[in-house]
């Protein structure tokens, strides 16, 4: 089978600071030197691109300066971190991997990680 399998955790709970991390792992059918990783958010059948990065194998992932994502790669594994999350950002975050170079091109899409974000309770005012 020429398809590329992508694995990611089913559920992740964001920290109280609105940070969520998960691993996206792909079983590469080829010897790719250039890989593109995209995080998609699916909520209420709407799909939006959260962030995307292209990296050379062995190098760091480089997201755009204004991206809410950071990440590191190790072999066929990408460690993704999404920051600045709020309760309204709860949803299914899908890892999409593309082997860009050399040909042939391969596409792999994970089943998604449900990220739950709970806004922290505001600190009660003190009388002191």
């Amino acid at each position: 089978c020429k398809a590329m399998h992508v694995a990611q955790p089913a559920v992740v709970l964001a920290s109280s600071r609105g940070i969520a991390s998960f691993v996206c792992e792909y079983a590469s059918p080829g010897k790719a030197t250039e890989v593109r990783v995209t995080v998609l958010r699916q909520a209420d059948s709407q799909v939006t691109e959260v962030c995307a990065a292209t990296y050379m194998m062995g190098n760091e992932l480089t997201f755009l300066d204004d991206s809410i994502c950071t990440g590191t790669s190790s072999g066929n594994q990408v460690n993704l971190t999404i920051q600045g999350l709020r309760a309204m950002d709860t949803g299914l975050y899908i890892c999409k991997v593309e082997l860009m170079y050399p040909p042939p091109y391969y596409l792999g899409i994970g089943n998604g990680t449900q990220i739950y974000v709970i806004d922290p309770e505001p600190c009660p005012d003190s009388d002191f």
Epitope: A3, M4, L40, E49, L107, I109
Partner: antibody, heavy 118, light 108 residues
Framework: QVQLVESGGGVVQPGRSLRLSCAAS????????MHWVRQAPGKGLEWVAV????????NYADSVKGRFTISRDNSKNTLYLQMNSLRVEDTAVYYC???????????WGQGTLVTVSS | EIVLTQSPGTLSLSPGERATLSCRAS???????LAWYQQKPGQAPRLLIY???SRATGIPDRFSGSGSGTDFTLTISRLEPEDFAVYYC?????????FGQGTKVEIK
């Protein structure tokens, strides 16, 4: 709304060149892969070429490799197909199409007819 | 290269009938990367189904897709007059991107 409009088709002699354009609107070109697909008269669909995101990665069908060049100008939201050394068998309607988030081809242009004949 | 073979070549049916179109791959294709398109004369193809079974935006629920591995099916539960067209399957999980040769659904 998303719209793709091809232009540049016409009648050309074998061995000559032609450049097709595809003007995209309603979305940001740099975030999508873009393909050219062709259809010979009365025949099925045949994939021709793709250019990815910033344009640095491209793939071609064996039938056009070395003769056709796909490119994009993201600042102009335009996709191109430079066709050199044209052959009679390149006669077809050429469609540009966008890759959706899942990899399928979700929007297509109306097509432009290229006829290679002596 | 993954070769997709569609059958039958032509399907002659009446409005209201059920249409079952088959697409067979020369090697296993992940169901995530199999699409179906509809094309009417003089028009560009239109995406109907992606991921083997997910309907594209605006596609009526009489269209459904199923299958896995090497065998995929497009079903039109009750043919409407506007459904008579040519249908293509496509794999998009790896290059080169390939299409089936098409199945023509014509009015009986």
């Amino acid at each position: 709304q998303v719209q793709l409009v091809e232009s540049g088709g016409g009648v050309v002699q074998p061995g000559r060149s032609l450049r097709l354009s595809c003007a995209a609107s309603g979305f940001t070109l740099s975030r999508y892969g873009m393909h050219w697909v062709r259809q010979a008269p009365g025949k099925g669909l045949e994939w021709v070429a793709v250019t990815w995101y910033d344009g640095s990665n491209k793939n071609y069908a064996d039938s056009v490799k070395g003769r056709f060049t796909i490119s994009r100008d993201n600042s102009k939201n335009t996709l191109y197909l430079q066709m050199n050394s044209l052959r009679v068998e390149d006669t077809a309607v050429y469609y540009c199409t966008r890759v959706d988030w899942w990899g399928a081809f979700d929007f297509w242009g109306q097509g432009t007819l290229v006829t290679v004949s002596s | 290269e993954i070769v997709l073979t569609q059958s039958p070549g032509t399907l002659s049916l009446s409005p209201g009938e059920r249409a079952t179109l088959s697409c067979r791959a020369s090697q296993s294709v992940s169901s995530s990367y199999l699409a179906w398109y509809q094309q009417k004369p003089g028009q560009a193809p239109r995406l109907l189904i992606y991921g083997a079974s997910s309907r594209a935006t605006g596609i009526p629920d009489r269209f459904s897709g199923s299958g896995s591995g090497t065998d995929f099916t497009l079903t039109i539960s009750r043919l409407e007059p506007e459904d008579f067209a040519v249908y293509y399957c496509q794999q998009y999980g790896s290059s080169p991107w390939t299409f089936g040769q098409g199945t023509k659904v014509e009015i009986k």
